[in-house]
Interface confidence: low
């Protein structure tokens, strides 16, 4: 990723083009950072990846840093919240953006405890902010379903993150082709499935439907 | 600034009980961190004991687990080890450290960046 | 346990030189892997962390890479500061465990 350390002002509004945020708690001003095993909020001027989110497919969100995805534990939802493996079906990981809120299911929301971890828990209302955005929404930056070109799943939409090569890739990536074309995995695994296409160039114009579906003859 | 300083007596005798504390100062021990005790015999290298998080989950190295006790005492903001059965092998300057790290999916990724300035422990009678 | 064997277990050397030690895991340990440098008498500082990535503070002519099994850490320019041993050490499973480190000497 070359994160630095450090997150510059500068830095950070790069990666809020790419769609990756720090999460920040509007009323406690401190950031969500993921840690060995727990979330906790820390100040966010010491901004590393490890507070560097990203909306992904299926509703998940992914921490940079920690490579993984926030999970809702329903064998003990009210414990600290933690990131899990994003294909994991042990957890909820599934997160809905709403007025500020962060809600998973049965009326879950991401709060903070006395301690500064990071819970979810159904009884108040905490709002998160996009850190560096001017009290921006971090509904701002949720999903978009990418949809591939040529590869073998027949414009499937990217599977973001995906497993490949030992890491998670929230984004395309050149990563094993040596003619430089970017591309994604349509399944979580792609070691596993083998399935993927290309990545639409975004500096092209708008990619047509023939480029991405086979014409019936 | 986090800082570690470990106490305890300097010498045990053989089959006795090595008892050290390491005191964190300028942090809290319950933030999401492990705490680890690594040792380092007189001319020798580094070997990690264990360590525990503030929750009192543990870690210990398998070659010492039947001797090895690491506790936290979160109002006192510090956490302790006990050596059992102790012979002249146990030896050593022994370290607390502060590991700091991230888990990766579900694989822990991690590293010791704050370490106590270290206690000499003489087995002997 | 994972072990972890470093070479050369010491080496002289003479400033301004370039040098080079290997830590070889006995199983993959993707790039979980650590390097700290110990002064006589002093307590061990973390250089390198992740393989790859220098910590804060850590003059830039130390340098880590290696993946895997293979891991190298490289003083670019050998300064009177930097004799000391070095170790590497692993956490991608618990027990966290060290090479037997390293003796940089002068020459």
């Known amino acids: 990723e070359g994160v630095a350390a450090a997150l510059t002002p500068e830095r950070l509004l790069e990666w809020q083009d790419k769609g990756i945020f720090v999460i920040q708690s509007e009323s406690l001003k401190k950031c969500i950072q993921a840690g060995k095993s727990v979330l906790t909020l820390e100040n966010c001027k010491q901004a590393n990846k490890h507070m560097l989110w990203k909306w992904v497919s299926n509703h998940g969100l992914f921490n940079i840093g920690g490579s993984g995805c926030l999970g809702l534990n329903f064998s003990a939802p009210e414990q600290p919240l933690s990131l899990y493996e994003c294909d994991s079906t042990l957890v909820s990981l599934r997160w809905r953006c709403n007025r500020k809120m962060i809600t998973g299911p049965l009326q879950y929301s991401v709060q903070v405890a006395h301690d500064n971890t990071v819970v979810a828990s159904r009884k108040y209302i905490h709002k998160w902010i996009s850190y560096g955005s001017g009290g921006g929404d971090i509904c701002e930056y949720l999903h978009k379903d990418l949809h591939t070109i040529k590869g073998n799943t027949h414009g499937m939409p990217c599977m973001f993150p995906f497993q490949y090569n030992h890491q998670w890739h929230h984004e395309c990536t050149r990563e094993g082709r040596e003619d430089d074309l970017l591309w994604c995995a349509t399944t979580s695994r792609y070691e596993r499935d083998e399935k993927w296409g290309f990545c639409p160039d975004p500096t092209s114009a708008e990619v047509g439907c023939d480029t991405i579906w086979e014409k019936d003859l | 600034q986090i800082t570690l300083k470990e106490s305890g007596p300097g010498l045990v005798k053989p089959s006795g009980t090595l008892s050290l504390t390491c005191a964190v100062s300028g942090g809290s021990i319950s933030s999401s961190n492990w705490w680890s005790w690594v040792r380092q015999p007189p001319g020798k290298g580094l070997e990690w004991i264990g360590e525990?998080?503030?929750?009192?989950?543990?870690n210990y190295n398998p070659s010492l687990k039947s001797r090895v006790t690491i506790s936290v005492d979160k109002s006192k903001n510090q956490f302790s080890l006990k050596l059992s059965s102790v012979t002249a092998a146990d030896t050593a300057v022994y370290y607390c450290?502060?590991?700091?790290?991230?888990?990766?999916?579900?694989?822990?990724?991690?590293?010791?960046?704050?370490w106590g300035k270290g206690t000499t422990v003489t087995v002997s009678s | 346990d994972i072990q972890l064997t470093q070479s050369p277990s010491s080496l002289s050397a003479s400033v301004g030189d370039r040098v080079t030690i290997t830590c070889r895991a006995s199983q993959s340990i993707d790039d979980h892997l650590n390097w700290y440098q110990q002064k006589p008498g002093k307590v061990p500082k973390l250089l390198i962390s992740s393989a790859s990535t220098l910590q804060s503070g850590a003059p830039s002519r130390f340098s880590g890479s290696g993946y895997g099994t293979d891991f190298t850490l490289t003083i670019s320019s050998l300064q009177v500061e930097d004799f000391a041993t070095y170790y590497c050490q692993q956490s991608y499973s618990p027990p966290q465990t060290f090479g037997q480190g390293t003796k940089v000497e002068i020459k």
């Open positions: 525990i998080y503030h929750s009192g989950s543990t």
């Open positions: 450290a502060r590991d700091d790290g991230w888990r990766y999916g579900s694989v822990y990724y991690y590293y010791m960046d704050v």
